[in-house]
Amino acid sequence: KIVLDPSGSMNIYLVLDGSDSIGASNFTGAKKCLVNLIEKVASYGVKPRYGLVTYATYPKIWVKVSEADSSNADWVTKQLNEINYEDHKLKSGTNTKKALQAVYSMMSWPDDVPPEGWNRTRHVIILMTDGLHNMGGDPITVIDEIRDLLYIGKDRKNPREDYLDVYVFGVGPLVNQVNINALASKKDNEQHVFKVKDMENLEDVFYQMIDESQSLSLCGMVWEHRKGTDYHKQPWQAKISVIRPSKGHESCMGAVVSEYFVLTAAHCFTVDDKEHSIKVSVGGEKRDLEIEVVLFHPNYNINGKKEAGIPEFYDYDVALIKLKNKLKYGQTIRPICLPCTEGTTRALRLPPTTTCQQQKEELLPAQDIKALFVSEEEKKLTRKEVYIKNGDKKGSCERDAQYAPGYDKVKDISEVVTPRFLCTGGVSPYADPNTCRGDSGGPLIVHKRSRFIQVGVISWGVVDVCKNQKRQKQVPAHARDFHINLFQVLPWLKEKLQDEDLGFL
């Protein structure tokens, strides 16, 4: 498999058959698949060097792995997008052997003197062809030469099979399955041959191709493949329930932010709640996690403005649940990204010198910001798309707080909507879905560059649009939701999570 190890070295060779038998639409589809693969790999913070070859009678090398920009995913994607099927129109035979020889030439080194670290570089060849080579001879001989060059299958104790993966995608109206199978790697419990119809569900294909065991701790990563559970798609999501004898129980959500901490809303708990009465589950697992302590933001005080006629005051409505035992990360349990951390800098593919302010400008610009939250409906987690009103609609969004029960007599809305809040909901630019009571404490998320970054914690709403846990279809325009802006509580997060290796900026 493609081992995505941010600390490893990898060359990926994209080889695309542009011969007559492929056809323009299949060529375009294959290109799209490769663009998606480049993006998927880049989302892991891995920076492989790419080689890019198209071929028919002759190969054309568009990107060499030795080029400075070959590890710049955006630049490689641009080169790929600029390739036309017509480029091989005049000489449209199929010489797959020559194309693979072009790959071999990129792999090999001058004077047979291997560079330092050559034996630690993994090589991945992704060949898109119909297998109908009609000139140049059998391409399998070049695969053998490549294996020989990389010292694969020669050493009994160290066969190095994981240093070469050859994936073949059958494209075109007629595919020679025998030829394609012959070229692809054969490894136990791995799939290296894919068909055209597989490409309709690329996430499923990538799931078969990628080994992410070295990057399970990466924040904000998800798997969207069809066989995935809700928690493959939202692996940070935590369910919280507080049992109060004779008072029933309170349900909330939270987000895994590190191996020991779940971030949620402070209002989910009262000072009387004991740790043993708080149940937290992650990854869709039945068992509850043992809790060491709940840490409230020191400025949170729900009764802080009772004298001023404000029955409930949600400023600084955040809490961290510290777990007794370390979480074991996997595909259904992994952290979400937090603002102003090194992990988020890498997730957004920003330079290492990026400041907290620059992250804020990237994630929360002064405009309507597309975001999402996760809600549970009929035992299923679903993503709800909303817009954070952070531009010209911000004022009107915040003013609608006056329609919340108990806030109707508030003269100055900034008394309840402090600078700590982000506002969503309403009907412009689109009709936003609203949060339900049980969504409280869950993350408000910005999805960028295939990664998920938490920017807020769901706190309170103006209208209860979820009578009997069913979302009403028709809701008033003033149905707004308010979320604690994580950029505004960073000093507290940084202090409490200082031992969690998150690299706060």
């Epitope: 291997p114 050493d155 009994r156 104790k157 160290n158 190095r160």
Partner: antibody, heavy 121, light 111 residues
Framework: EVQLVESGGGLVQPGGSLRLSCGTT????????MSWVRQAPGKGLEWLGF??????????EYAASVKGRFTISRDNSKNTLYLQMNSLKTEDTAVYYC????????????WGQGTLVTVSS | EIVLTQSPATLSLSPGERATLGCKAS??????????MNWYQQKPGQAPRLLIY???NRESGIPARFSGSGSGTDFTLTISSLEPEDFAVYYC?????????FGQGTKLEIK
């Protein structure tokens, strides 16, 4: 045909140095481990060390008895293995063999004819 | 390091007889399903010759009367019916762990 030929043996005084060579033909030299083995008169075989193949960067490994005194190196362009022996002792007197160590099964499948080193005053 | 002990030190047999030579390792020489134990034959004035690799695999060109067996720490070289040219010294050698080590040898002599 695989062939290994040792050279450089001879008479040397205690404390002296000697460099043995092992020229090879008939195989891709850099793809193999190459070992040195010696045999003192009337005694058994003693493995001295090897140079690993290219996937391991040709790094050497030594037996404790010669570590620090003997150095194994190779010149892949000349398909030649070397054994540099320093601070020689009388007990280093032996026939010195080079052998190809096949990584396909980790056994010494081809041997040279040996070269005699005599350490004596 | 792994110490290899061969037994017997000397074995006196006649042509046509069956020879059984033993080699015991101070610790297992198995790795990932393979036993890294090899057997060599050496005749006077000659370089050693590989007979058996990985405990039981006969090197090409070696007669079928030579066979190897064993795993872990106990290994055996068997010569089913001795020929006159088989009388020599036999060494076991492990290649599982660095440093490689040889046994002290078993001398097979004509009775």
């Amino acid at each position: 045909e695989v062939q290994l030929v040792e050279s450089g043996g001879g008479l040397v005084q205690p404390g002296g140095s000697l460099r043995l060579s092992c020229g090879t033909t008939g195989f891709t030299f850099r793809d193999y481990y190459m070992s040195w083995v010696r045999q003192a008169p009337g005694k058994g075989l003693e493995w001295l060390g090897f140079s690993r193949h290219r996937a391991y960067g040709y790094t050497p490994e030594y037996a404790a008895s010669v570590k620090g005194r003997f150095t194994i190196s190779r010149d892949n362009s000349k398909n030649t293995l070397y054994l540099q022996m320093n601070s020689l002792k009388t007990e280093d007197t032996a026939v010195y063999y080079c052998a190809r160590d096949n990584p396909g099964y980790y056994a010494m499948d081809y041997w040279g004819q040996g070269t005699l080193v005599t350490v004596s005053s | 390091e792994i110490v290899l002990t061969q037994s017997p030190a000397t074995l006196s047999l006649s042509p046509g007889e069956r020879a059984t030579l033993g080699c015991k390792a101070s610790q297992s020489v198995d790795y990932d399903g393979d036993s890294y134990m090899n057997w060599y034959q050496q005749k006077p004035g000659q370089a050693p010759r590989l007979l058996i690799y990985a405990a039981s695999n006969r090197e090409s060109g070696i007669p079928a009367r030579f066979s190897g067996s064993g795993s872990g720490t106990d290994f055996t070289l068997t010569i089913s019916s001795l020929e006159p040219e088989d009388f020599a010294v036999y060494y076991c050698q492990q290649s599982n762990a660095d440093p490689y080590t040889f046994g002290q040898g078993t001398k097979l002599e004509i009775k």
